[in-house]
Interface confidence: medium
């Protein structure tokens, strides 16, 4: 243990205020009581301490709370949070969403730091599931959060949380993630009427099965091409030309520009050329007239 220097006469801090910015590091160490600091943490953020001075304050808190800071202190860490290591944060038990928000605010506008990543990990694990309020908060600060979870992790997202999801939150989700999220969204929005339902479910349709796409085609939804291109290929292939035409409505003309890309390309190969011609778009590559179509997958299932 390093021998501590005594606090000079008259310099003992009675409260955390701006006068402390003129203290040298050793004076802060000697003259600021750790318990006083802990009870007045909310003041630290308003005082322009140097990084070196913040290091001293952190050291004092570390000595006072070697097992990890209490939440009452954590909530008011402010910029001192940036001085914490992932190992420090691992000792914390953060249960309040307000505390999480306060700390995320400190890092706002910056990419996710190791500290923030660890904080979120601890918080969500402590809660046991991604409830709506937590998801709301996390996606507000980090829109990519939802798509950074594995399908298994997403399975613990309750359907009620889906209401917090915005279309941009799903931008980078891949099909396996949407496979998990789509049934939850379908459940969450089941009581909405046709047009409102489509607006809400649209972002999740990359996980929709064929039968749901067939049902949507009967509801005049006018799906845009961007959404159509994100649908599962295996879900699109069984759709008839008439169903795709109804599904896309006026957007059906966009198929021509996408005819070389999946899932449009693969879908065209499964349609009769006669049927494709009825669209009047000049789509080529369908099954020539007079050819017999064998569904080998059905044959295998029967044998």
């Amino acid at each position: 243990e390093v021998e501590k220097t005594a606090c000079p006469s008259g310099k003992k801090a009675r409260e955390i205020d701006e006068s402390l910015i003129f203290y040298k590091k050793w004076e802060l160490e000697a003259c600021v009581d750790a318990a006083l600091l802990a009870t007045q943490m909310d003041r630290v953020n308003a005082i322009p301490f140097t990084y070196e001075q913040l290091d001293v304050l952190k050291h004092k808190l570390d000595e006072l709370y070697p097992q990890g800071y209490p939440e009452s202190v954590i909530q008011h860490l402010g910029y001192l949070f940036l001085k914490m290591s992932p190992e420090d944060i691992r000792k914390w038990n953060v249960t309040s969403l307000e505390t999480l928000k306060a700390l995320l605010e400190v890092n706002k506008g910056h990419e996710m730091s190791p500290q923030v990543a660890t904080l979120i990990d601890r918080f969500v694990k402590g809660r046991g599931q991604l409830d709506k309020d937590t998801l709301d908060t996390l996606t507000a600060f980090y829109p990519g959060y939802l798509c950074s979870l594995s399908p298994e992790e997403l399975s613990s997202v309750p359907p009620s949380s889906i209401w917090a999801v915005r279309p941009q939150d799903l931008d980078t989700c891949d099909p396996r993630q949407l496979d998990v999220l789509y049934p939850k969204a379908r459940l969450a929005f089941q009581n909405m009427n046709g047009s409102e339902y489509f607006v809400k479910i649209q972002s999740f349709l990359g996980g929709a099965p064929t039968e749901d796409l067939k049902a949507l085609s009967q509801q005049n939804v006018s799906m845009d091409l961007a959404t159509f291109m994100k649908l599962r290929t295996d879900a699109v292939l069984p759709l008839t030309v008439a169903e795709v035409q109804k599904l896309l409505g006026p957007h059906v003309e966009g198929l021509k520009a996408e005819e070389r890309h999946r899932p449009v390309r693969d879908w065209i190969l499964r349609q009769r050329q006669d049927d494709l011609d009825t669209l009047g778009l000049g789509l080529q590559g369908g099954i020539p007239n007079g050819y017999l179509v064998l569904d080998l997958s059905m044959q295998e299932a029967l044998s």
Partner: nanobody
Framework: EVQLLESGGGLVQPGGSLRLSCAAS????????KAWFRQAPGKEREFVAS????????AYADSVKGRFTISRDNSKNTLYLQMNSLRAEDTAVYYC?????????????????WGQGTLVTVSS
């Protein structure tokens, strides 16, 4: 049980580049590779970078920010670390780590499986 196999290490000159790979096999539905740590001779193991399952959310140690890029290919269950502008102080054994996790985390205690490591030496 998850097996992690790192590759791509080697000797490189200062300013050079390397790309590390970490292939995962076994029970990768639950535990997936999502972080790189490193340990220099005589030093403790330290966090380098971590990535969420979807690939968009990442976290980097300050010392490598802007020089290293972490990425993953879910279809191949493989994690990558592209290292550019390498410095002598980047010399270390680089370990891949797998965990369940909720997005990126720098906390080594959250990782359940570790690779054997691949040595990166930066020297002229």
């Amino acid at each position: 049980e998850v097996q992690l196999l790192e590759s791509g290490g080697g000797l490189v000159q200062p300013g050079g580049s390397l790309r590390l790979s970490c292939a995962a096999s076994g029970h990768t539905d639950s535990y997936y590779p999502k972080a790189w740590f490193r340990q220099a001779p005589g030093k403790e193991r330290e966090f380098v970078a971590s990535i969420g399952w979807g690939g968009r959310m990442t976290a980097y140690a300050d010392s490598v920010k802007g020089r290293f890029t972490i990425s993953r290919d879910n279809s191949k269950n493989t994690l990558y670390l592209q290292m550019n502008s390498l410095r002598a102080e980047d010399t270390a054994v680089y370990y891949c780590a797998a965990g369940i996790g909720w997005a990126p985390t720098a906390d080594s205690g959250e990782y359940d499986y570790w690779g054997q490591g691949t040595l990166v030496t930066v020297s002229s």
